[in-house]
Interface confidence: medium
């Protein structure tokens, strides 16, 4: 990995082992305030494998609403608006970084974790083996 | 929102005005250990809009590597394996909260930061507007 | 006509192995994903284990995680299911079962062929 | 203890319409799609819905899925004598790494 020198303003620290405890400033700062407007807007509805949305909350957990994708259906959507069984519409997935407070109920106290999200879906050709 | 009593046994914190400073624990708990055997594999081949991933490093940042999806195509493959261009690839977008490090090159100081990336790419019919 | 025939089931000691297979016929094996799921004595169904089509990627229970080994044999069609270190609470029907979907899927076209099973009991 | 909870039994007389409630969570049925199995006593189960609502060929109309959330549901409308069996629902659990199976619920057939 690449060192960086330690900046000398930086808060004390008591304790330098990992697993480490660290300061986090909570206010989030926001790089995509003029982000590309065409995000994932109603892709979920114009696409060939279209999603639905639906709403994950856990009061535990920061950030507590999480949209999650799940696939219309098990084909993708032909150019006559007909499902095609030969293709298939899979979640695309991704693990991101959540906060969970810890101990529980916890306003000022949290502990990283991973977890799994399915953001949209995409059409793929299936695996498929022909007996010669 | 959902109220919750505050456990007793919380760490003092003296700051209770928001944006507020917390203490994050960065062992990662990982909630995926056995996920999905389907997840996003050989997708990016596999998709009728396929795409690249691209290694996007910061040391400022936790995670330091992020992987970027680019849509390999403007149109989307057909069933002839050719690029249609009467359909777009486009990518799927998603807000993560990465933990910058505030001040710079502090081990234990971090602002919590939102960031757009793109996971992967889905095929869309455009949007045409037709003169009446 | 699709099927699937399990074998090598039978009566044995707490702590010692058994090997049960599963032979496939009238579907192209080795485009399927498998699974093993079994039955205790009047009771529910409980998935054991499941394999890839390519038998790259396998998933356990936690019940018998670092005890039973799934794998496959593409070339004879063939599916199998290692147990070792065997327990009473081990004791049931054990079916092998088809993915309904060829490809990378393990369950979401439900699992849509099953063999008749075959009995193991785990007995001093 | 099954993650995936069913009511341990269900009961219609022939003709009525009985409905079979399947209760996960986020890393089951919130974020995949739910399997229906029927057992009839003394032999293999046999795949009746998967998708959510997706009948495989032979299926009768009767049966019927349905999800929301993280529950799902089966249907059986113009219940029938040969509908006397176990049923099951299934799908896969993040969490856990694997697919997991519903505690099961006995369909009987009055009168």
């Known amino acids: 990995g690449i060192t960086i020198p330690r900046n000398p303003g930086c808060p004390n620290s008591e304790d330098k082992n990992f697993p480490r405890t660290v300061m986090v400033n909570l206010n989030i700062h926001n790089r995509n305030t003029n982000t590309n407007p065409k995000r994932s807007s109603d892709y979920y509805n114009r696409s060939t494998s279209p999603w639905n949305l639906h709403r994950n909350e856990d009061p535990e957990r920061y950030p507590s609403v999480i949209w999650e994708a799940k696939c219309r259906h098990l084909g993708c959507i032909n150019a006559d608006g007909n499902v095609d069984y030969h293709m298939n519409s899979v979640p695309i997935q991704q693990e991101i970084l959540v906060l969970r407070r810890e101990p529980p109920h916890c306003p000022n106290s949290f502990r990283l974790e991973k977890i799994l999200v399915s953001v949209g879906c995409t059409c793929v050709t299936p695996i498929v083996h022909h007996v010669a | 929102g959902i109220t919750i009593p505050r456990n007793p046994g919380c760490p003092n914190s003296e700051d209770k005005n928001f944006p507020r400073t917390v203490m994050v624990n960065l062992n990662i708990h990982n909630r995926n250990t056995n996920t999905n055997p389907k997840r996003s594999s050989d997708y990016y081949n596999r998709s009728t809009s396929p795409w690249n991933l691209h290694r996007n490093e910061d040391p400022e940042r936790y995670p330091s590597v992020i992987w970027e999806a680019k849509c390999r195509h403007l149109g989307c493959i057909n069933a002839d394996g050719n690029v249609d261009y009467h359909m777009n690839s486009v990518p799927i977008q998603q807000e993560i909260l990465v933990l910058r490090r505030e001040p710079p090159h502090c081990p234990n100081s971090f602002r919590l930061e939102k960031i757009l990336v793109s996971v992967g790419c889905t095929c869309v019919t455009p949007i045409v507007h037709h003169v009446a | 006509e699709v099927q699937l025939l399990e074998s090598g089931g039978g009566v044995v000691q707490p702590g010692r192995s058994l090997r049960l297979s599963c032979a496939a016929s009238?579907?192209?094996?080795?485009?399927?994903?498998m699974h093993w799921v079994r039955q205790a004595p009047g009771k529910g169904l409980e998935w054991v284990a499941v394999i890839s089509y390519d038998g790259s990627n396998k998933y356990y229970a936690d019940s018998v995680k670092g005890r039973f080994t799934i794998s496959r044999d593409n070339s004879k069609n063939t599916l199998y299911l290692e147990m070792n270190s065997l327990r009473p609470e081990d004791t049931a029907v054990y079916y092998c079962a088809k993915v309904g979907a060829s490809g990378d899927y393990y369950y979401s076209y439900g699992l849509d062929v099953w063999g008749q099973g075959t009995t193991v009991t785990v007995s001093s | 203890q099954s993650v995936l909870t069913q009511p341990p039994s269900a009961s219609g007389t022939p003709g009525q319409t009985v409905s079979i409630s399947c209760s996960g969570r986020?890393?089951?049925?919130?974020?995949?799609?739910v399997d229906w199995y029927q057992q009839v006593p003394g032999a293999a189960p046999k795949l009746l819905m998967y998708y959510d609502s997706i009948r495989p060929s032979g299926v009768p109309d009767r049966f019927s899925g349905s999800q929301s959330g993280t529950s799902a549901s089966l249907a059986i409308s113009g219940l029938q004598s040969e509908d006397e069996a176990d049923y099951y629902c299934?799908?896969?659990?993040?969490?856990?790494?694997?697919?997991?199976f519903g505690s099961g619920t006995k369909v009987t057939v009055l009168g």
């Open positions: 986020q890393s089951n049925i919130g974020r995949h799609y």
């Open positions: 299934a799908t896969w659990d993040d969490s856990l790494g694997g697919y997991v």
């Open positions: 009238g579907f192209i094996f080795s485009n399927y994903g």
